[in-house]
């Protein structure tokens, strides 16, 4: 039932998670862990914030957004296939067992082979038939028609459009958003 997010080997992955602080600067501790959210705390913690700052992080894991405004989305730098799996964003709301927990599934795909533009045959062999894009929700898949019907310029343009739309969607995906207070 986890929401699925995708990235390619070598890219940065983005796992969205948000909350709305009750008042400016009134922050809630958050932890990110590898693996589904356990009953308490986070397992295999990769990053943690407290009421003021990021107080624990490991290499390649960082918060790119303004966590002081409740954007605690996780960026994983230069991903490898080993980064695939479930990640837990846990918003540690004051109280007894009151935390908000979000399990996000990260799927890492092998890097696409860059085509050599002068050789149609090599491009056709290397270019995948399925291009994956990210909409405002779980991963969607767009299918290219039969490759012989599309010329190199069209494919190049389509690939650029898909890349641009993915980058745009990555900036603000349908992440978990909650209001505190």
């Amino acid at each position: 039932s986890e929401v699925e997010y995708r990235a390619e080997v070598g890219q940065n992955a983005y796992l969205p998670c948000f909350y709305t602080p009750a008042a400016p600067g009134n922050l809630v501790p958050v932890c990110w862990g590898k693996g589904a959210c356990p009953v308490f705390e986070c397992g295999n913690v990769v990053l943690r914030t407290d009421e003021r700052d990021v107080n624990y992080w490991t290499s390649r894991y960082w918060l790119n957004g303004d966590f002081r405004k409740g954007d605690v989305s996780l960026t994983i730098e230069n991903v490898t296939l080993a980064d695939s799996g479930i990640y837990c964003c846990r918003i540690q709301i004051p109280g007894i067992m009151n935390d908000e927990k979000f399990n996000l599934k990260l799927v890492i795909k092998p890097a696409k082979v860059t085509p050599a533009p002068t050789r149609q045959r090599d491009f056709t062999a290397a270019f995948p038939r399925m291009l994956t894009t990210r909409g405002h929700g779980p991963a969607e898949t767009q299918t290219l028609g039969s490759l012989p019907d599309i010329n190199l310029t069209q494919i190049s343009t389509l690939a650029n459009e898909l890349r641009d739309s993915r980058l745009a969607n990555d900036l603000r995906d349908s992440g978990a958003t909650i209001r505190i207070g």
């Epitope: 039932s1 986890e2 589904a36 959210c37 009953v39 109280g95 007894i96 067992m97 009151n98 935390d99 908000e100 927990k101 979000f102 399990n103 978990a176 909650i178």
Partner: antibody, heavy 113, light 107 residues
């Protein structure tokens, strides 16, 4: 605001089963724990079990294993507790709670022939 | 299972009096202790979490303290609306366990 609305009072016969409901509103149902607690007449509070609606994982008090079954329906933001093989000892008020901070109003279960 | 021993089981106190209720765990619960107030026919209300942190909206006359196995709830100056039954709860590990309760009545 967070609200938990529990189903109405039940009168059932010994040996039967009953399914109590707890409808959540005012928060993201799939992201927060639900606990169930029993209170027998003139007695204290007993923890029955826990469920996380996000993935359906559960924990039970050993005392209630085989007696209580916890489930959720994400589409209606409702948590359920089924109680089976009922006896008069199961007569009590049953509470659901988000975490243990926001409580439902309780459902009174009476088991009597 | 962790056993929570709460005392006293009942007590009488006067308005304005300082009241203390204690709870002892059968093992260290790492301050994962909560206090609840319950009035007749009502759901429990959370007062304190993590042993000493007051829930938003709870009057400041309530306070919690303790660590390890020993914890207490104090009402600095008793008011009429504080009458009811008080329960402690450990949530350090499953199964979660409550104390037997302390019935607080007006002297």
């Amino acid at each position: 605001q967070v609200q938990l609305q529990q189903s109405g009072a039940e009168l059932v016969k010994p040996g039967a089963s009953v399914k109590l409901s707890c409808k959540a509103s005012g928060y993201t149902f799939t992201s927060s724990d639900i606990n169930w607690v029993r209170q027998r007449p003139e007695q204290g509070l007993e923890w029955i079990g826990w469920i996380f609606p996000g993935d359906g994982s559960t924990k039970y008090n050993e005392k209630f294993k085989g007696k209580a079954t916890l489930t959720t329906d994400k589409s209606s933001s409702t948590a359920y507790m089924q109680l089976s093989r009922l006896t008069s000892e199961d007569s009590a008020v049953y509470f659901c709670a988000r975490g243990l901070d926001y409580w439902g109003q309780g459902t009174t279960l009476t088991v009597s022939s | 299972d962790i056993k929570m021993t709460q005392s006293p089981s009942s007590m009488y106190a006067s308005l304005g009096e300082r009241v203390t209720i204690t709870c002892k765990a059968s093992q260290d619960i790492n301050s994962y202790l909560g206090w609840f107030q319950q009035k007749p026919g009502k759901s429990p209300k959370t007062l304190i979490y993590r042993a000493d942190r007051l829930v938003d909206g709870v009057p400041s006359r309530f306070s919690g303290s303790g660590s390890g196995q020993d914890y207490s709830l104090t009402i600095s100056s008793l008011e009429y609306e504080d009458m009811g039954i008080y329960y402690c709860l450990q949530y350090d590990e499953f199964p979660l366990t409550f104390g037997a309760g302390t019935k607080l009545e007006l002297k």
